[in-house]
């Protein structure tokens, strides 16, 4: 598993460095998660040919994965800091059930999958401290999440491989869009 943010060799070598700002910590946390996703995708791609599937083919799925849209205020046009931050936090909370699903999907990268899940929880906490309007953030319903998890786990092997690939790719794209937007805040 990659070294958690704040524990890399550079930090050890420079103990008197300025402490990270809130934005730097968030940036580092997202990149740490992205690194974890890359490692998980390597195992997924080695195991199945999902990674060769076209994006169009993958889009034909019934997963309701969080996605950035123009209305969310995170893009160049119509950028809105508060709306965007709410979307990022809400999206991350919605991804949590999918990250839970990933926990039993990896053999050699079990720790890595756990690290991605735990790091995402930490990222959500960081971002909630940054948000002014916490009331606007909708938390997913636990009962709905539980039945979704059961449904995903009941799929056949091929669909489970497809689901794993889609979750990782979508989560990566969501995090990248989030990081770009957060850089402007």
């Amino acid at each position: 598993a990659p070294v958690p943010p704040g524990e890399d060799s550079k930090d050890v070598a420079a103990p008197h460095r300025q402490p990270l700002t809130s934005s730097e910590r968030i940036d580092k946390q997202i990149r740490y998660i992205l690194d974890g996703i890359s490692a998980l995708r390597k195992e997924t791609c080695n195991k199945s040919n999902m990674c060769e599937s076209s994006k169009e083919a993958l889009a034909e799925n019934n997963l309701n994965l969080p996605k950035m849209a123009e209305k969310d205020g995170c893009f160049q046009s119509g950028f809105n800091e508060e709306t965007c931050l709410v979307k990022i936090i809400t999206g991350l909370l919605e991804f949590e059930v999918y990250l839970e699903y990933l926990q039993n999907r990896f053999e050699s990268s079990e720790e890595q999958a756990r690290a991605v899940q735990m790091s995402t929880k930490v990222l959500i906490q960081f971002l909630q401290k940054k948000a002014k309007n916490l009331d606007a953030i909708t938390t997913p319903d636990p009962t709905t999440n539980a039945s979704l998890l059961t449904k995903l786990q009941a799929q056949n092997q091929w669909l489970q491989d497809m689901t794993t690939h889609l979750i990782l790719r979508s989560f990566k794209e969501f995090l990248q869009s989030s990081l770009r937007a957060l850089r402007q805040m």
Epitope: Q76, K172, R180
Partner: antibody, heavy 122, light 110 residues
């Protein structure tokens, strides 16, 4: 020092598929956050972004070319490739490959190949 | 996918300052700090000059500077020299991992 070198046929017939390869030396194409783009320049005209393949092998294409373009890689050879189908004379251009050092928050190209001229003509 | 708009040509005499503008449509440039500038000499590949709006690439003299105001980015070259004569292109990130280039500007040193 990172170096990029384009290769492929200089002449392609209309309606055929244009295929180019970019060989990268001095660094791995799978290094984290790097991305590898194809950019073209018709004679006497400006630069046009075609598409990109990132450090995970994910691809993104220009909306205007999306239906005809495909970018892939061969990590064992440290190469990435461009395929453009159903070409017309309007696709005649110098084709460049280039590196983005940080696809997450970079969006700039610090290393370029020298470019290869492709003419579409029967 | 419409290109960013640049003036077709600008000119100046040695020692002067010139500014090349790069205007975005649909707020391409407005919010995000992902504008870069490239110099292209005849028959050669473009060369990175400025990235992230204001950061000079390695080895680029401080005569070259970048800025942004609203939906327009600018490249300023001060103390113009004969070897600065070239085509200049801006580029920007566009939503969904897309990039777009400017129309290009021919700089002539008189």
């Amino acid at each position: 020092e990172v170096q990029l070198q384009e290769s492929g046929p200089g002449l392609v017939k209309p309606s055929q598929t244009l295929s180019l390869t970019c060989t990268v030396s001095g660094g791995s194409i799978t290094s984290r956050y790097y991305a590898w783009s194809w950019i073209r320049q018709p004679p006497g005209k400006g630069l046009e972004w075609i598409g990109v393949i990132d450090y995970d092998g994910d691809t993104y294409y220009s909306p205007s070319l999306k239906s005809r373009v495909s970018i892939s890689w061969d990590t064992s050879k440290n190469q990435f490739s461009l395929k453009l189908s159903s070409v017309t004379p309007a696709d005649t251009a110098v084709y460049y490959c280039a590196r983005d050092p940080d696809v997450v928050t970079g969006f700039h190209y610090d290393y370029w190949g020298q470019g290869t001229m492709v003419t579409v003509s029967s | 996918q419409s290109a960013l708009t640049q003036p077709p040509s600008v000119s100046g005499t040695p020692g002067q300052s010139v500014t090349i503008s790069c205007a975005g449509a649909n707020n391409d440039i407005g919010t995000y700090a992902y504008v870069s500038w490239y110099q292209q000499l005849p028959g050669t590949a473009p060369k990175l000059m400025i990235y992230k709006v204001t950061t000079r690439a390695s080895g680029i003299p401080d005569r070259f500077s970048g800025s942004k105001s609203g939906n327009t980015a600018s490249l300023t070259i001060s103390g113009l020299q004969a070897e600065d004569e070239a085509d200049y292109y801006c580029a920007s990130y566009r939503n969904f991992n897309n990039a777009v280039f400017g129309t290009g500007t021919k700089l002539t040193v008189l």
